[in-house]
C-alpha cells in the first residue's frame, strides 16, 4: 500500500495516427504505477469501450484494431494497488 499522495499523470499525446491504428504516448513519474488502464471509446456511439492495460514501466503503446475515419476518445489512468488516478483524455480522428 502506498503512503502519502500518489502523483497524477502528466499529459497524454497521440504520437502517430494511422488508417486503423494509433500510437499513444504519456508522461508519468517513474515507479509510481503498477499499470496503466486505457479505454478506447468510439465517439457518439453506445458501443462498449475497448479496454487494455500496459505495464507501469511503459510510457507508450500501440492501439490496433481501430476503424478508419472514426472519432475516438482515449482515456488513460494510472493504477497502484490501492489507488487510481484521475483519468486523462484525448480525442483523435483516424
Amino acid at each position: 500500500a502506498s503512503t502519502g499522495e500518489t502523483p497524477n499523470l502528466g499529459e497524454v499525446v497521440v504520437a502517430e495516427v494511422g488508417w486503423d491504428a494509433l500510437k499513444l504516448n504519456w508522461t508519468a513519474p517513474e515507479g509510481a504505477y503498477e499499470y496503466f488502464f486505457i479505454q478506447v471509446q468510439e465517439a457518439d456511439t453506445v458501443e462498449a469501450a475497448q479496454n487494455l492495460t500496459v505495464p507501469g514501466g511503459l510510457r507508450s503503446t500501440d492501439l490496433p484494431g481501430l476503424k478508419a475515419a472514426t472519432h475516438y476518445t482515449i482515456t488513460i489512468r494510472g493504477v497502484t494497488q490501492d489507488f487510481s488516478t484521475t483519468p486523462l483524455s484525448v480525442e483523435v480522428l483516424t
Epitope: Y35, N51, L52, V79, Q81, D82, S84
Partner: antibody, heavy 121, light 107 residues
C-alpha cells in the same frame, strides 16, 4: 498464496437469475481483474467478462451483454457474477479467475474451484 | 471482438511425438496470449503466458512462440499425462477470447 473460493452449486428455473460469488484471499484484490469463464458440459471455455474492482469498470463479452452483471465488493474482496433470463443452455460450470494480462502484468493465474449452475424446469 | 481460431480441433498422437497447436488472432494483438491445459472435471491450468513465457512448475517440453496474429504451442515429446484439451486465450484487448480448444488423444 492467492485463493479464489466460489459459492456452491445452484439449480435454477428457466427465466430466473443466478448470482455466483468469488472470494479472494492471500493477495491484493482491488487492482487485479477478476474474470468469469464458463464451460457447458462437453464444451470449450467461454470468457464472459471481467471487472477491475479499484476502477469499478467491467467488460463483457458481446454474447452476454445485457444479461450478465459483474460487480465487486472491495471491503470483502469478493466478486460477483449475476446472469439473468436463464435458459437451459446456461447449464455450465462457472469459474472465476485472475488471469495474466488484463490489469497487471505479473505472472499469476489463479482459478476458483468452479460453481455448477443447472437450469431446469 | 477478436476471434481466436485454434487448429486442429483434435489430434491423435503417441507418447514421444512432437505436437504443435496453432492459434490465429483475427487482428494483431500484443503478446498477451496464454496456453491452457484442461483435464476432465478440473479447472484449466496455464502452461504459457505472454506468448512464450513458461509458467513456473510446467515442464520444459512445453513451449510457446509467435507474435502479432499467429501463435504456436509445442510439446516437444508427448508424455502420458499430456493427453488433455488445450486452449489459447487472448487477454490483452478486452473482451478476452478463447480458442475453440484442441483435444489431444492417444493414437
Amino acid at each position: 498464496q492467492v485463493q479464489l473460493v466460489q459459492s456452491g452449486a445452484e439449480v435454477k428455473k428457466p427465466g430466473s437469475s443466478v448470482k455466483v460469488s468469488c472470494k479472494a484471499s492471500g493477495g491484493t484484490f482491488s487492482s487485479y481483474a477478476i474474470s468469469w469463464v464458463r464451460q457447458a458440459p462437453g464444451q470449450g471455455l467461454e470468457w464472459m467478462g471481467a471487472i477491475i474492482p479499484i476502477l469499478g469498470i467491467a467488460n463483457y463479452a458481446q454474447k452476454f451483454q445485457g444479461r450478465v452483471t459483474i460487480t465487486a465488493d472491495k471491503s470483502t474482496s469478493t466478486a460477483y457474477m449475476e446472469l439473468s433470463s436463464l435458459r437451459s443452455e446456461d447449464t455450465a460450470v462457472y469459474y472465476c479467475a485472475r488471469l495474466y494480462g488484463y490489469a497487471y502484468y505479473g505472472a499469476f493465474d489463479y482459478w476458483g474451484q468452479g460453481t455448477t449452475v443447472t437450469v431446469s424446469s | 471482438d477478436i476471434q481466436m481460431t485454434q487448429s486442429p480441433s483434435s489430434l491423435s498422437a503417441s507418447v514421444g511425438d512432437r505436437v504443435t497447436i496453432t492459434c490465429r488472432a483475427s487482428q494483431g494483438i500484443r503478446n498477451d496470449l496464454g496456453w491452457y491445459q484442461q483435464k476432465p472435471g478440473k479447472a484449466p491450468k496455464r502452461l504459457i503466458y505472454a506468448a512464450s513465457s513458461l509458467q513456473s512448475g510446467v515442464p520444459s517440453r512445453f513451449s510457446g512462440s509467435g507474435s502479432g496474429t499467429e501463435f504456436t504451442l509445442t510439446i516437444s515429446s508427448l508424455q502420458p499425462e499430456d493427453f488433455a484439451t488445450y486452449y489459447c486465450l487472448q487477454n490483452g484487448l478486452q473482451p478476452a477470447t478463447f480458442g475453440q480448444g484442441t483435444k489431444v488423444e492417444i493414437k
